[in-house]
Interface confidence: medium
């Protein structure tokens, strides 16, 4: 399977909420012994590979934000830790996987990565990730609501399957 990023750039005004989204593409094994570990983190556009560096989102690590569920299940983070930081990650039955960030500040600007690990019986090494940019703006040039820019088909399909 692969991960697609429907939008490569989100431009939002300060104080707004935004939901960043990734989507699982291709055949997803829904066997009873297959589960998925999904998470989000901040990164930088590294020279070697985007998303190789895993930095916290609002002081929460990828570990704090992860979901672990069966291939046929929906899930979301319900723990207080994430919600206290204005964050919630969620996954639906259709392969959509998102993180919602509330009350954006300029400090939230940067590169965000979603990551999916397929776990088979023990732990599979099948990892895929997607990247997108968030720009938080303030002042008279800031949009009134979030503006999203679709990924080109090449960007969307060119996500790594490690």
């Amino acid at each position: 399977f692969k991960v697609a990023t429907p939008y490569s750039l989100y431009v939002c005004p300060e104080g707004q909420n935004v939901t960043l989204t990734c989507r699982l593409l291709g055949p997803v094994d829904k066997g009873h012994d297959v589960t998925f570990y999904k998470t989000w983190y901040r990164s930088s556009r590294g020279e070697v590979q985007t998303c190789s560096e895993r930095r916290p989102i609002r002081n929460l690590t990828f570990q704090d934000l992860h979901l672990h569920h069966g291939g046929h299940q929906a899930a979301n983070t319900s723990h207080d830790l994430a919600q206290r930081h204005g964050l919630e990650s969620a996954s639906d039955h259709h392969g959509n996987f998102s993180i919602t960030m509330r009350n954006l500040t300029l400090l939230d600007s940067g590169l965000y990565c979603c990551l999916v690990v397929e776990i088979r019986h023990h732990h599979s090494e099948h990892r895929v990730h997607g990247a997108m940019e968030l720009q938080v703006q303030t002042g008279k040039d800031a949009p009134s609501n979030c503006v999203v820019y679709p990924s080109s088909s090449q960007d969307s399909e060119n996500i790594t399957a490690a």
Partner: antibody, heavy 118, light 104 residues
Amino acid sequence: EVQLVESGGGLVQPGGSLRLSCAASGFTFSSYTMSWVRQAPGKGLEWVATISNSGSYTYYLDSVKGRFTISRDNAKNSLYLQMNSLRAEDTAVYYCARDTVLSPFDYWGQGTTVTVSS
Amino acid sequence: EIVLTQSPDFQSVTPKEKVTITCSATSSISYMHWYQQKPDQSPKLLIKDTSELASGVPSRFSGSGSGTDFTLTINSLEAEDAATYYCHQRSSFTFGQGTKLEIK
């Protein structure tokens, strides 16, 4: 500081049972997958079992499946390994290890010794 | 199950020497991880994801490889590096048999 402290090891006869415990501190225990890894005397490392952060998913080494049960109590920051029908080949030091799925076992306890002998 | 075979099983080396430990897998894998275990101590994560040093690990350690062949290298060995080193992969959670490094 991340700390993992195992307890519950000891001498047990073949066919007997033991329950190992691992007390975790210094990190958000409920966010982490946890595992047990063992090391027989003078031998290498062997993974035994893994449990997801919520406890919903468990994974076992084939030779312990049906005999060992991994569990956790997130309210108590504790990991457990219930070992039944013990065999001589289960004799080992048992380590609990933190497991981030993305990274391998990044922190280990000091180990607790299980000896199965008549 | 993927089997990992390390080479050599044992090596006696002098300080400042360069040491190379190899780990060969029976099937192709994406990432290899390495642990160091000193006598009467718990294992310690050394390298994750083939080449990324774990926190606090000296830069004389490095990892490389892909597919079925992976390498742990210690440049300019120090006395404190006397230990057993294990490779590890997560597709079926297996470890190599270990390589014991003795300092002359």
